[in-house]
């Protein structure tokens, strides 16, 4: 970036620069016409009558340097070709010299500082590249010369620029005094202030833009070069804060819009709010869960909000004596989570309607809670009791929800107790074709034995068609139509009002080979 200290092209009033000496043929301020056809203030000198060695000086007004260490002077000028001037002496020149003088204030006068090199500091002798020529019978042709000189290092408050002519026929069309500075820059979310280079390269500390935070130490820096350009290098060290994303080619951190969020420091973009969450404000680092939806403590901020599952469905039970198996289907709504478990609660309800938690002798397999499969086996049920089992589905956010989890209840009433198994069978008589059996009356817990069922079959013939049954109301039975000398396996069960009890152990009996032994009393 160039910062102008003086540009005569922009001056509308007379420049009124100082000339020396006050004599004929001196530099003269004239109106000129620039490339854009605008009227400009110019200075011209063309003293072909001057005595040899006589210099014409022209000095600008005092120019404050405004912190610049090196100032550049771009001079646009025209120069007459000595050869085109018929009356030009041998002292005709096609060059001029540029000087500067530093001071702390505008203290120069028409006579001071002395018009010579030292105190004036010589910058350069400038030669024209293009000369204005005139050939007989033709118009004069010329071209503007442009020369940029470097002044400095400067240290005082300001300076004057001076031009020394020693025999040229020339015009200064414009003078542009400027210094170079690195303009403020934002790159990779880092702001570097406008900097005037004081040396070849100057390190400049950067600061993070609004809503960006440092991510590295030391703070990011960039080098401002003497030519007013920032050195090409990668700048790192700032990233957008949570709730903000980089925008406009990494120049600003822009607040995440409504409905979006960014959870951490970094270069990531804002993301749409996960399912079942929202951000009503801009600049959100997290999206809030909708009513009825939650995030578990272990869920990342970027995860969707979830809800407890609905109740399990279709609970079925299989009662076998004092053992119950409950099975169910998964809930219709999982709540959007994978960590689904089940819990079973048991209550024992009296005919009057009062319910109490089930007793401690009941066992659950694999357990009453944290069930991952949709079943449980329950042992230790008492007979003739109505149980209410409540099966609930749970997930990682169930504990965050208000109110109890929804459950699916099932009522199970156990049977009254059946008679115990009949054992201790005796053969009281046997013949080649019959057996008379008897047994002890079992102690039935729920009322008297109503009758018995005898199940028997020949040993070795165990198919369903070979098994025979016999009902008897007494604790004895006669089995007829048996094979001679054959072995039979016999089982008995008793029935009470609660139903049949289990068959007892198989009893081994054998028929006689001949009649002489028939009805022979045998003791079991």
């Amino acid at each position: 970036l160039e910062e102008t200290l003086l540009n005569t092209k922009l001056e509308t009033a007379d420049l009124k620069w100082v000339t020396y000496p006050q004599a004929e043929g001196q530099w003269e301020e004239l109106s000129g016409l620039d490339e854009e056809q605008h009227s400009v203030r110019t200075y011209e000198v063309c003293d072909m009558k001057r005595p040899g060695g006589q210099a014409h000086w022209l000095r600008t007004g005092w120019v404050p340097r405004r912190g610049a260490v090196h100032v550049y002077a771009t001079i646009r000028f025209t120069m007459m070709e000595c050869l085109s001037l018929p009356r030009a002496s041998r002292s005709c020149k096609e060059t001029f010299t540029v000087f500067y003088y530093e001071s702390e204030a505008d203290t120069a006068t028409a006579h001071t500082p002395a018009w010579m090199e030292n105190p004036y500091i010589k910058v350069d002798t400038v030669a024209a590249e293009h000369l204005t020529r005139k050939r007989p019978g033709a118009e004069a042709t010329g071209k503007v010369n442009i020369k940029t000189l470097r002044l400095g290092p400067l240290s005082k408050a300001g300076f004057y620029l001076a031009f020394q002519d020693q025999g040229a026929c020339m015009a200064l069309l414009s003078l542009h005094l400027f210094y170079k500075k690195c303009s403020w820059l934002i790159t990779n979310l880092t702001y570097f202030p406008e900097t005037v280079p004081r040396e070849l390269v100057v390190p400049v500390a950067g600061s993070c833009v609004a809503n960006a935070v440092p991510t590295a130490n030391p703070s990011p820096s960039l080098y401002c070069r003497e030519d007013g350009q920032w050195a090409e290098q990668q700048v790192t060290g700032c990233s957008c804060a949570p709730g903000y994303e980089a925008a406009e080619s990494n120049k600003v951190c822009r607040a995440c819009g409504q409905g979006t969020f960014k959870p951490q420091i970094g270069d990531e973009s804002c993301l749409p709010c996960p399912a079942n969450s929202h951000s009503n404000n801009i600049g959100s680092p997290v999206c809030l869960c909708r009513i009825g939806y939650y995030r578990a403590r272990s869920d990342p901020r970027s995860s969707p909000c979830t809800t407890p599952p609905s109740a399990p469905r279709s609970v079925v039970h299989h009662l076998n004596g004092s053992t119950l198996r409950l099975e169910w289907s998964a809930p219709l709504e999982s709540g959007g989570r994978e960590d689904l478990t089940y819990a079973v609660r048991c209550r024992e309800c009296r005919p009057g309607g009062s319910c109490l938690p089930c007793g401690g002798d009941m066992t659950f397999d694999p357990g009453p809670r944290d069930l991952v499969e949709p079943w449980v086996a329950i042992r230790g049920l008492r007979p003739d009791v109505t149980y209410t089992f409540e099966v609930a589905a749970l997930n990682g956010v169930s504990t965050l929800a208000t109110g109890p989890p929804p459950f699916e209840p099932v009522n199970v009433t156990t049977d009254r107790e059946v008679p115990p198994a009949v054992s201790d069978i005796r053969v009281t008589r046997s013949s080649p074709s019959s057996l008379i059996l008897s047994w002890a009356i079992p102690r039935a817990p729920s009322g008297a034995v109503l009758d018995y069922e005898v199940k028997y079959h020949e040993k070795g013939a165990e198919g369903p068609s070979s098994v025979r049954f016999l009902k008897t109301s007494e604790n004895r039975a006669e089995l007829r139509g048996l094979k001679r000398g054959a072995s039979y396996l016999v089982q008995v069960r008793a029935r009470s009002e609660a139903g049949y009890g289990p068959f007892g152990q198989e009893h081994h009996s054998q028929t006689q080979l001949d009649e002489s032994e028939s009805w022979r009393e045998q003791l079991a």
């Epitope: 004239l30 000129g32 026929c169 015009a171």
Partner: antibody, heavy 126, light 107 residues
Framework: QVQLVQSGAEVKKPGSSVKVSCKAS????????ISWVRQAPGQGLEWMGR????????NYAQKFQGRVTITADESTSTAYMELSSLRSEDTAVYYC???????????????????WGQGTLVTVSS | DIQMTQSPSSLSASVGDRVTITCRAS??????LNWYQQKPGKAPKLLIY???ILQSGVPSRFSGSGSGTDFTLTISSLQPEDFAVYYC?????????FGQGTKVEIK
């Protein structure tokens, strides 16, 4: 402001010559173009020629070639126009005019004339 | 020499009128064309140079346009002091030429 002051009116015989002067007051003279323009009674403007004093040589309109001579004296900042072989049709007001910009201070030399002398009436009559 | 033809040679107009004068060159002169105003008994006055550049101190109601061979001088709203003769002037060649002039009279 520069002033161009011309010499006084002249009455000339046909066949004779006339030399009109134009003195510039104040500042640079050598690098401006000085043109001579004439205007016959009730007629339009007619360009005769131009000189840039520093170069010494002049350009002339074809019509006046060989009959007109334009010169300049840098020491006195004066330009001259001499017309020979005068005829009655040369009766006119003769103006000197200076260009708006010097040859060195204009990017495009439009040779526009923004400073004019008061005019010199030359009457050619027998 | 390059010939310059002005039209019309004269025109009558009222104060406040928009007036247009044209000038045609016999060959391309780029934009090397100037316009002058002359009042009786006075030296000409430069109005416009370089086809369209208004000379310092000239009212902005005067404007010029054109390039190549066709040029126009326009007075947007004629004022009483604008009644005069107007000349175009080409400076493209080593030899300048003027147009024959256009007289602007009061209607």
């Amino acid at each position: 402001q520069v002033q161009l002051v011309q010499s006084g009116a002249e009455v000339k015989k046909p066949g004779s010559s006339v030399k009109v002067s134009c003195k510039a007051s104040g500042g640079t003279f050598s690098t401006y173009a000085i043109s001579w323009v004439r205007q016959a009674p009730g007629q339009g403007l007619e360009w005769m020629g131009r000189i840039i004093p520093i170069f010494g040589t002049a350009n002339y309109a074809q019509k006046f070639q060989g009959r007109v001579t334009i010169t300049a004296d840098e020491s006195t900042s004066t330009a001259y126009m001499e017309l020979s072989s005068l005829r009655s049709e040369d009766t006119a007001v003769y103006y000197c005019a200076r260009s708006s910009y010097t040859i060195l201070t204009t990017y495009y030399n439009y040779n526009a004339m923004d400073n004019w002398g008061q005019g010199t009436l030359v009457t050619v009559s027998s | 020499d390059i010939q310059m033809t002005q039209s019309p040679s004269s025109l009558s107009a009222s104060v406040g009128d928009r007036v247009t004068i044209t000038c045609r060159a016999s060959q391309n002169i780029n934009n090397f064309l100037n316009w002058y105003q002359q009042k009786p008994g006075k030296a000409p006055k430069l109005l416009i140079y370089g086809s369209s550049i208004l000379q310092s101190g000239v009212p902005s109601r005067f404007s010029g346009s054109g390039s190549g061979t066709d040029f126009t001088l326009t007075i947007s709203s004629l004022q009483p002091e604008d009644f005069a003769v107007y000349y175009c002037h080409q400076v493209s060649d080593t030899s300048d030429t003027f147009g024959q002039g256009t007289k602007v009279e009061i209607k």
